[in-house]
Interface confidence: low
């Protein structure tokens, strides 16, 4: 008896070692052979294993060896009776064959996967428990060549098998075996197979449905987004005034003689700022009052107006080209050019005003939107003004009153208020007072530029040729055109960009006025200071204030033109009387009070010598409540004056802490000096009356704390009244004070109200539609309607 292949042994490294050998001839292993084994420890017991036949000549012997360890070495002896056939040693730790994994099962899992699970053949205490890796064989029962082998090298005895990797409808079998890498073991025997049917449907079958569902979902999302945007647009965006949709007509407050489009102040270089862009950047912020707010502020310090403190950013009419969407088309409606007689040192004033209003620094573009209320007031004033002048016929001359229309001075320009360049947009009030910018950025003020003017008016203003988007007032004397018939492609001409004298980096005028004033921040301030402060300033030709005086008279009495003094057209007062003629009847305008236009007195004292009719009437009457914010004279005080010695801090970028002073300077306009008065006198006097969005007459609250004049809070229109603490200190906010010091309460009971959008002929103004109310912190009811009073008072507002 001989051993053909000596025994090879493997241990499961837990309890059993198996040795297998082959004899040289068929042998009855259990009857003829014995395998003895013992640990080679001294004194260890000798054990005997009885082999079994695996094949005819192959014998296998399983030796129960407990707790094999690396140090264990077994001495093996193969005996055939008393004959030692083979002797050798065996170290179980060096010949490991792991146990066969058990309990292989297959479970359907989520997401069309099969979960194969089996059990680790070793208890957790055994060193091999955490050493095993597995091999899983998955084969198609009907296709021997269709099989896959997966190596599971992680700890868990599981395998997730995507059903899509198997043929649908086929029967598959899986089996698993283990291997202990750290022991350089052999693979265990294969576990018994487990069979299952792969009933997975390929994803291609679901593709059409999935694509359809995806398309529907995407479509639903798109539709919801579309309708949401439409709803937002209707509810919010469409409520924002748009030059392309607004019937507003820009009123040009300008010099009466010289075209400022091409004019440069001495020592000033033109800014690289085309007129259309300048005007857009000053105008369009006014149209985005609601919702756009302070979306983009200028990153650099822009030029502040002289009265502008570090309060809030003044954004209108500051350039905001970064923020505004340019209108698709510029269809210009007729522009009213209302000018006054020339004044003395117009050139210096023009320089200073032009510097600030014509071409704001591009660096300051994108100014913050904070002046919406003032702008709305200004635009609505213009709206009402034009409605009353032209009704709905599109002309500026009321029917039957062509002779009293205001003709444009020959040299007037449409550039003084750059917003006039664009259609259906009104001027914006420059920021001031509590609404002053809190940072210097975006603080350019669109103050009116003063320029010499002439009362000759057969010649249309040069702006017509300079910018075809403009139509001078004179061009409409003999025609009545519909709004918007002007040229829609304005010529792009560079404006002289002139900086405030107080800004070091800006060019300084070589010949500043002798009494350099802190310049008012806006045309409203300028007009207010000129008209209210200087009652007796003589001026060549028509009195500087005559235009406004006539306007007021017209407002108060609505009578035919009076020849009481030189003025525009046939009469100095004709234009405004024509306006007045459209107002409710009953008001009379007996003439100008003594010492006014006839005497060349440039100041307008609306509430001095008030009589039951209007100025000049013998008996006092109730103070007119429709004052445009300019009809009353605030009590002045010397310390509030704008004298020549005014601090230069009012001329440039205002340092922090000067906001109070800035406001004070506006509270005593009577103290202004002559240069300013002369300069201001050439401007048309009007202020914002109504909210631009709702057509309601605008009334203001004021919480002026430091000014000398006490301003009485009064209701404001519902659509644009906001926090009274944030209202601008502009001419509209000037105190309505009676000559005797009695404060004028600019509010009426609702009983006297009629819609402000209705002219005497009953024609509805395009601005009478109500708009959604802004957030209000003041106590007034936001639903009040703006009205024109039918009472004999000149005008009343609520």
């Amino acid at each position: 008896v001989k051993v053909l292949h000596e025994p090879s042994c493997f241990s499961d490294y837990i309890s059993t070692s198996v040795c297998q050998w082959k004899m040289d001839h068929p042998t009855n292993c259990s009857a003829e052979l014995r395998l003895s084994y013992q640990l080679d420890f001294m004194g260890s017991e000798n054990h005997t294993c009885v082999p079994e036949n695996r094949e005819d000549s192959v014998c296998v012997c399983s030796m129960p060896i407990d707790d094999a360890v690396e140090a264990d070495v077994y001495q093996l002896d193969l005996w055939a009776g008393q004959q030692l056939l083979w002797s050798g040693s065996f170290q179980p730790s060096k010949h490991v064959k792991p146990r066969t994994p058990g309990n292989l099962t297959v479970h359907p899992n989520i997401s069309h996967t099969w979960l194969l699970m089996w059990t680790n053949p070793y208890p957790t205490e055994n060193h091999l428990h955490s050493e095993l890796t597995y091999m899983v064989n998955v084969s198609n029962d009907n296709d021997p060549e269709d099989f896959k082998v997966y190596n599971v090298t992680y700890m868990g005895p599981t395998l997730r098998l995507a059903a899509s990797t198997l043929k649908s409808g086929a029967s598959y079998s899986a089996r698993v075996r283990a291997w202990a890498q750290t022991y350089n073991s052999t693979w265990s025997d294969w576990s018994p197979s487990t069979t299952w049917l792969n009933y997975y449907e390929p994803w291609e079958q679901h593709l059409p449905l999935g694509v359809s569902i995806s398309c529907l979902v995407i479509l639903a999302i798109c539709l919801s987004c579309y309708f949401s945007i439409i709803k937002i647009k209707k509810g919010w965006w469409d409520q924002i005034p748009n030059p392309a949709h607004s019937p507003l007509v820009a009123i040009v407050i300008q010099d009466s003689q010289v075209s400022l489009w091409g004019k440069r102040s001495r020592g000033q270089e033109p800014a690289k700022c085309p007129h259309w862009k300048t005007c857009l950047t000053k105008l369009l912020p006014c149209l985005l009052e609601h919702g756009l707010g302070r979306e983009e502020e200028s990153p650099k310090t822009a030029k502040n107006g002289p009265l502008q403190g570090p309060g809030k950013p003044a954004w209108c009419p500051v350039e905001v080209s970064k923020t505004i969407l340019w209108p698709e088309s510029i269809s210009v409606v007729q522009c009213v050019e209302l000018s006054e007689a020339p004044v003395d040192n117009e050139e210096e004033e023009e320089v200073e005003e032009d510097k600030r209003s014509l071409c704001p620094s591009l660096e300051g573009s994108g100014g913050s939107f904070q002046e919406g209320r003032e702008g709305i007031v200004a635009r609505l004033t213009e709206s009402l003004f034009l409605d009353l002048l032209g009704g709905e016929n599109g002309g500026f001359c009321p029917q039957g009153l062509e002779e009293s229309c205001l003709p444009p001075p020959s040299g007037s320009v449409g550039a003084q208020m750059p917003w006039a360049q664009f259609p259906r947009a009104g001027p914006r009030a420059a920021p001031e007072g509590p609404e002053q910018p809190r940072r210097p950025e975006s603080a350019l003020q669109a103050s009116p530029t003063q320029s010499a003017g002439s009362s000759a008016f057969p010649e249309p203003p040069p702006v017509v040729t300079d910018n075809p988007a403009y139509r001078s007032f004179g061009s409409f004397l003999g025609q009545s055109s519909d709004p918007g018939d002007g040229d829609s492609d304005p010529e792009l001409a560079d404006r002289p960009g002139e900086a405030d004298p107080g800004i070091p980096s800006a060019p300084q005028p070589p010949e500043p006025p002798a009494a350099l004033q802190p310049e008012p921040e806006s045309w409203e301030q300028i007009l207010r200071q000129s008209v209210l402060q200087h009652r007796a300033a003589p001026a060549p030709g028509p009195g500087p204030g005559s235009g406004y005086r006539e306007f007021t008279c017209a407002v108060k009495q609505g009578s035919a033109p009076d020849a009481g003094g030189p003025g525009f057209g046939p009469s100095g007062e004709a234009g405004y009387k024509a306006f007045c003629s459209l107002l409710p009847g009953g008001a009379t305008c007996p003439g100008t009070s003594g010492g006014e236009a006839g005497s060349g007195e440039g100041g307008y004292k609306p509430f001095q010598s008030l009589t039951p009719g209007c100025p000049g009437a013998p008996t006092p009457v109730p103070v007119p409540l429709f004052t445009f914010g300019l009809d009353t004279e605030p009590p002045g005080s010397p310390q509030d004056s704008l004298g020549a010695g005014s601090s230069p801090e009012h001329l440039g970028v205002e340092p922090a802490g000067k906001e109070e002073d800035s406001r004070k300077t506006l509270l005593a306009p009577e103290q202004a000096t002559d240069p300013l008065r002369d300069d201001l006198a050439s401007s048309i006097v009007y202020s914002a009356l109504t909210c631009h969005l709702c057509g309601h007459l605008k009334q203001w609250h004021d919480q002026e704390e430091r000014g000398k004049a006490h301003i009485v809070p009064s209701p404001c229109c519902g659509c644009c009244c906001g926090d009274r603490s944030s209202l601008l200190l502009s001419p509209l906010r000037a105190p309505n004070v009676l000559p005797g010091g009695v404060l004028l309460e600019a509010s009426l009971s609702p009983a006297s109200l009629v819609p402000s959008g209705v002219s005497k002929e009953g024609k509805s103004s395009p601005f009478s539609q109500p708009a959604s109310s802004s957030a209000q912190s003041s106590s007034q009811t936001p639903k009040k309607l703006a009205v024109l009073s039918t009472e004999p008072t000149c005008m009343s507002a609520s």
């Epitope: 420890f41 001294m42 260890s44 407990d66 360890v69 140090a71 205490e125 055994n126 060193h127």
Partner: antibody, heavy 119, light 107 residues
Framework: QIQLIQSGPELKKPGETVKISCKAS????????MSWVKQAPGKGLKWMGW????????TYADDFKGRFAFSLETSASTAYLQINNLKNEDTASYFC????????????WGQGTLVTVSA | DIVMTQSHKFMSTSVGDRVSITCKAS??????VAWYQQKPGQSPKLLIY???YRYTGVPDRFTGSGSGTDFTFTITSVQTEDLAVYYC?????????FGGGTKLEIK
């Protein structure tokens, strides 16, 4: 968890026989061998021998051959130590201890059974 | 039989101290040495096997070292709960034998 629970204390007279049981739980009983350890009062540990729970083959230390016998009841996962012909020096605590897989160390121990032999 | 000798029957130490217990085999036992802890009234507990391997759940302040005939068991930072008797045992050959034990006392 793995536990080895031994039978209670025994009070015997010399010449009698005592059979101590050790019931295993928490693991596969036949996987690990079981040793028995004697600890006389105030003395150290003395290994008596072990039994293969897989094959049932016992191994005895020289000092514990003859009167001592290890046995199994695999179905009950229980190992037994039987001491015949008790002597006074047999008074001690007897522990069953399950082998560990890493070595011949004794990983789990029963709480011990005190056998008192007294005339 | 292989005799395992623990030279110190008693050792006194303080909490936080480092203490080492030695065990000497009468012959080379390679690394087949285990260490046990037996607290009063309790069963022994395996701490170290194969001379230097910590058993499952044993704190790492317990360490073992040595091979051949000299072995050392160390507690790097003694705690009060470490008061016990410590035994070494060889499992190189049967009969397995224990050392006499070293009783650790806390000052």
């Amino acid at each position: 968890q793995i536990q080895l629970i031994q039978s209670g204390p025994e009070l015997k007279k010399p010449g009698e026989t005592v059979k101590i049981s050790c019931k295993a739980s928490g693991y596969t009983f036949t996987t690990f061998g079981m040793s028995w350890v004697k600890q006389a009062p105030g003395k150290g540990l003395k290994w008596m021998g072990w039994i293969s729970t897989y094959s049932g083959v016992p191994t005895y230390a020289d000092d514990f051959k003859g009167r001592f016998a290890f046995s199994l009841e695999t179905s009950a996962s229980t190992a037994y130590l039987q001491i015949n012909n008790l002597k006074n020096e047999d008074t001690a605590s007897y522990f069953c201890a399950r082998h560990t897989f890493q070595s011949r160390g004794l990983a789990y121990w029963g709480q011990g059974t005190l056998v008192t032999v007294s005339a | 039989d292989i005799v395992m000798t623990q030279s110190h029957k008693f050792m006194s130490t303080s909490v936080g101290d480092r203490v080492s217990i030695t065990c000497k085999a009468s012959q080379d036992v390679i690394t087949t040495v285990a260490w046990y802890q037996q607290k009063p009234g309790q069963s022994p507990k395996l701490l170290i096997y194969s001379a230097s391997y910590r058993y499952t759940g044993v704190p790492d302040r317990f360490t073992g070292s040595g091979s051949g005939t000299d072995f050392t068991f160390t507690i790097t930072s003694v705690q009060t709960e470490d008061l016990a008797v410590y035994y070494c045992q060889q499992h190189y050959s049967t009969p397995w034998t224990f050392g006499g034990g070293t009783k650790l006392e806390i000052k």
